[in-house]
C-alpha cells in the first residue's frame, strides 16, 4: 500500500464528471499516471490522465458523458484506481470505492445578473449548472459581497438555507462599486462540499438623488 503521505480525493459534480486529485510526496513529476473508474452496475468505464498541478500533486477529470446527462445515481458505487507507469507495465497505486452522492461538489453557479439596482439595494439572480434533478429543492447557497477597501476573505457570508436563486442585497452605499459571488451545496453526502465560488458579478449602486434623503 501507498504510505500515509499519499492522498487520493475525488468529487462528483452530480451529473457526468468526477474530478480527482492524487498527491504523493517524493513522486517524480514526470511520472505518467491515470485514474480508472469502474462503476459496479454500469456497462461503461472511464479513464483520465493525471496532470501535475503542483510539486507533488496531480489532477484529472473523468468525463462520463454529456455535461447534463445523469450518469450515476445514489445507489452506484464506483471503484477508482490510480495507476502509474513503471517501465512497460502499469502499477496500481491506490484503490478506492467511491459513492458518488456521498462526495458531491457541484459546478459554480452561472449566469449571474443584476435584476434591479437602487441606491441602497440590489437584486441579483443566478442559475445552477449541471446539477442533478435528484436534489429537487435540497440545495443551499452562500453569497458574499465585496465592498470597496475590503478583501473577499473579509466579506461576511450570507446563507440561503433553501434553493433560492436570487438575493436582495440591502444597506448598500449609493454610487458605489461592488462585486458579488455565490456558491452552492447539496444537503446530502458524507463528504459533500461547497462548489467553487461563481465568477464575480460587478455592479454599481445608483447615486443618491441631489437634495433628497434616500
Amino acid at each position: 500500500a501507498v504510505n500515509g503521505t499519499s492522498q487520493f480525493t475525488c468529487f462528483y459534480n452530480s451529473r457526468a464528471n468526477i474530478s480527482c486529485v492524487w498527491s504523493q510526496d517524493g513522486a517524480l513529476q514526470d511520472t505518467s499516471c491515470q485514474v480508472h473508474a469502474w462503476p459496479d452496475r454500469r456497462r461503461w468505464n472511464q479513464t483520465c490522465e493525471l496532470l501535475p498541478v503542483s510539486q507533488a500533486s496531480w489532477a484529472c477529470n473523468l468525463i462520463l458523458g454529456a455535461p447534463d446527462s445523469q450518469k450515476l445515481t445514489t445507489v452506484d458505487i464506483v471503484t477508482l484506481r490510480v495507476l502509474c507507469r513503471e517501465g512497460v507495465r502499469w502499477r496500481v497505486m491506490a484503490i478506492q470505492d467511491f459513492k458518488p452522492f456521498e462526495n458531491l461538489r457541484l459546478m459554480a453557479p452561472i449566469s449571474l445578473q443584476v435584476v434591479h439596482v437602487e441606491t441602497h439595494r440590489c437584486n441579483i439572480s443566478w442559475e445552477i449548472s449541471q446539477a442533478s434533478h435528484y436534489f429537487e429543492r435540497h440545495l443551499e447557497f452562500e453569497a458574499r459581497t465585496l465592498s470597496p477597501g475590503h478583501t473577499w476573505e473579509e466579506a461576511p457570508l450570507l446563507t440561503l438555507k433553501q434553493k433560492q436563486e436570487w438575493i436582495c442585497l440591502e444597506t448598500l452605499t449609493p454610487d458605489t462599486q461592488y462585486e458579488f459571488q455565490v456558491r452552492v451545496k447539496p444537503l446530502q453526502g458524507e463528504f459533500t462540499t461547497w462548489s467553487p465560488w461563481s465568477q464575480p458579478l460587478a455592479f454599481r449602486t445608483k447615486p443618491a438623488a441631489l437634495g433628497k434623503d434616500t
Epitope: Q7, Q96, D97, N103
Partner: nanobody, 127 residues
C-alpha cells in the same frame, strides 16, 4: 466505546468466496471509521481495507487487486469484508478495527491509527 466481534472465517478453497462480519456493540457505531487488517504467521499485521463513518469512501490495499469489498450497515452496527477469488496468500487471521478520530477515506491508514480491535477470525485458503 464499542466492542468488536468478528465471524465468518474458516477454510475455503482457492478461487472461492468468504464473507467476514464484524459486529459492534456498546457504542455509537456510526461515529467510528472501520478497518480490516490481517496477519499471516511470522508476518506483520497488514492493512486490508478501511471505510469512513458513513461508508462514502473505502480504501483498499493494492494487494487485494479489487477482489475484496468492504461495506458497512450502520443500522445493524456491522461491517463486512467480502473476499472473492481468494488465494493461498490470503491465509491469515483477519482483524476488525475501529477508529474514533476522523478518517477522510483518502489515504491508507496505519494499524496504529485504530484504537479498538476485535479478537480476529482465522481464514485459511487451501490450494
Amino acid at each position: 466505546e464499542v466492542q468488536l466481534v468478528e465471524s465468518g472465517g474458516g477454510l475455503v478453497q482457492a478461487g472461492g468466496s468468504l464473507r467476514l462480519s464484524c459486529a459492534a456493540s456498546g457504542g455509537t457505531f456510526s461515529s467510528y471509521a472501520m478497518g480490516w487488517f490481517r496477519q499471516a504467521p511470522g508476518k506483520e499485521r497488514e492493512f486490508v481495507a478501511a471505510t469512513t463513518r458513513g461508508g462514502g469512501r473505502t480504501m483498499y490495499a493494492v494487494s487485494t487487486e479489487g477482489r475484496f469489498t468492504c461495506s458497512r450497515d450502520n443500522a445493524k452496527n456491522t461491517v463486512y469484508l467480502l473476499m472473492n477469488r481468494v488465494k493461498p496468500e490470503d491465509t491469515a487471521v483477519y482483524y476488525c478495527a475501529a477508529r474514533t478520530s476522523y478518517y477522510s477515506g483518502t489515504y491508507y491508514p496505519a494499524s496504529s491509527d485504530f484504537d479498538i480491535w476485535g479478537q480476529g477470525t482465522q481464514v485459511t485458503v487451501s490450494s
